[in-house]
Interface confidence: low
């Protein structure tokens, strides 16, 4: 990624370098782990030792929200953190050595997306540069979480139960309940993204119905209670 927003139009005599930024196209990591977003750069200011700011933002270049920002004083190799979203972002690289690499701790699925590094020289050589294409962070794998469980009216005055869970790898869902054998056949539908849904098509008895979601990282369960009176379901989770 060697494109960016170049503010400085001042002519430099035989510059050793042009502005450029090097980031990988993609970084993959598991939810709950840490990930490193590499970013290195070159610049035309041969011996710049003035104040600088390193910035990472998410979503889109130039306008996306900042997730990390640090500032180094003139001559200092210590970049003092001014912003670290939720305390989970920290600079691994040394901006004085042209390295803005960022570590993100304890990834959540919601951290997936594009991240853009930016450096600002704020001294005499007033200049700034930002990666335009950024690095795509893909967060995979999460223990199951049941996001919705409900009882709905079904055909012929019966009731059906729906259970939606998310996880990566997608969890297997199973229903159990007061039916004979304490287990009921479930129709497992294909979900979208990290979510899967299982339907228990006919709730034949009153009582507690439990949905269990399991994958290689763990399991989760939730229950609904069916009590039929006056022709209406009462449910509780």
């Amino acid at each position: 990624d060697a494109s960016g927003d170049l503010l400085n139009t001042e002519a430099h005599s035989a510059p050793a370098q042009r502005w450029s930024m090097q980031v990988p196209a993609e970084v993959n990591a598991e939810a709950g782990d840490a990930a490193v977003l590499p970013c290195t750069f070159t610049h035309p200011h041969r011996h710049y030792d003035g104040p600088l700011t390193a910035i990472w933002r998410s979503g889109e270049p130039y306008a996306g929200p900042q997730v990390f920002r640090c500032t180094a004083a003139p001559g200092s190799e210590l970049c003092q953190t001014a912003l670290s979203l939720h305390g989970r972002f920290r600079l691994l690289g040394n901006p004085r050595r042209n390295d803005l690499s960022l570590r993100v701790e304890r990834l959540a699925l919601a951290d997936s997306g594009r991240y853009f590094c930016r450096v600002e020289f704020t001294g005499d050589a007033h200049d700034r540069y930002e990666s335009r294409h950024g690095v795509r962070l893909r967060v995979t794998a999460a223990a199951p979480r049941i996001v919705n469980i409900s009882v709905l009216p079904g055909p012929a005055h019966a009731f059906r139960a729906l259970c939606t869970a998310e996880g990566e790898p997608p969890p297997a869902l199973a229903w159990s309940g007061p039916a004979p054998g304490n287990s009921s056949a479930a129709l497992q539908g294909q979900g979208h993204g990290y979510q899967v849904t299982a339907e228990l098509p006919a709730l034949t008895r009153d009582g507690r119905y439990t949905c269990t979601a399991a994958n290689s990282l763990g399991r989760a369960e939730a229950s609904v209670y069916l009590f039929r009176f006056h022709g209406a379901p009462g449910t509780s989770t």
Epitope: A31, G32, D33, H86, G87, R88, E105, R106, A108, L109, A110, A142, A143, P144, R145, E166, G167, E168, Y194, S216, L217, G218, R219, A220
Partner: antibody, heavy 121, light 104 residues
């Protein structure tokens, strides 16, 4: 039901290493979840120390990173805490704790009974 | 590092009273978890992801909040609720200092 039980010496000398064992029953530590050490100081302040994941990878509290090591013995379904160069401020009750991570957050759902460690000078 | 501040540090309540414990974060967090610790025992998960009751927790407990402000409410205090209560946020591994609940 999963159960966790800490064991180890109750008294450790200043500057030596603290070593504790967590024995897990009812669930294989290689099957999932995060297996943590958390300590509670006199006065009841809680501090997360670190974890070992089901795949053997680690993460530690940055304030302890140079002194802490968490390892495991999968054949015995145990994981271990080693804290080097202990000081009197390491006197605390140490808990081993299971953490569930659900993709959006993590929380500690099963706690051991705790073991009290005193650092003596 | 996100700092969690719990208030009050000590609360005294009468049987049947409704009480609310507060946990404020130094910057915005997505979720808060709550633990109960009775004297001489280990902490126990009470509420996870802000408002979900852990298994076996009585329905008189509830949690709410968002951003930097979270709360735990006990709708009708019982004698067995005497304990220390801790909030916990996951993203930078921190716990609040705790609220000690005494029953009058």
């Amino acid at each position: 039901d999963v159960q966790l039980q800490e064991s180890g010496p109750g008294l450790v000398k200043f500057s030596q290493s603290l070593s504790l064992t967590c024995s897990v029953t009812g669930y294989s530590i290689t099957s999932g979840y995060y297996w943590n050490w958390i300590r509670q100081f006199p006065g009841n302040k809680l501090e997360w120390m670190g974890y070992i994941r089901h795949d053997g990878s680690n993460n530690y509290n940055p304030s302890l990173k140079n002194r802490i090591s968490i390892t495991r013995d999968t054949s015995k379904n145990q994981f271990f805490l080693k804290l080097n160069s202990v000081i009197t401020e390491d006197t605390a009750t140490y808990y081993c704790v299971r953490e569930i991570y659900d993709g959006s957050s993590g929380y500690f759902d099963v706690w051991g009974t705790g073991t009290t460690v005193t650092v003596s000078s | 590092q996100i700092v969690l501040t719990q208030s009050p540090a000590i609360m005294s309540a009468s049987l049947g009273e409704e009480i609310t414990l507060i946990c404020s974060a130094s910057s915005s967090v997505s979720y808060m978890h709550w633990y109960q610790q009775k004297s001489g025992t280990s902490p126990k998960l009470l509420i996870y992801r802000t408002s979900n009751l852990a298994s076996g927790v009585p329905s008189r407990f509830s949690g709410s909040g968002s951003g930097t402000f979270y709360s735990l409410t006990i709708s009708s205090v019982e004698a067995e609720d005497a304990a220390d209560y801790y909030c916990h946020q996951w993203s930078s591994w921190t716990f609040g200092g705790g609220t000690q609940l005494e029953i009058k």
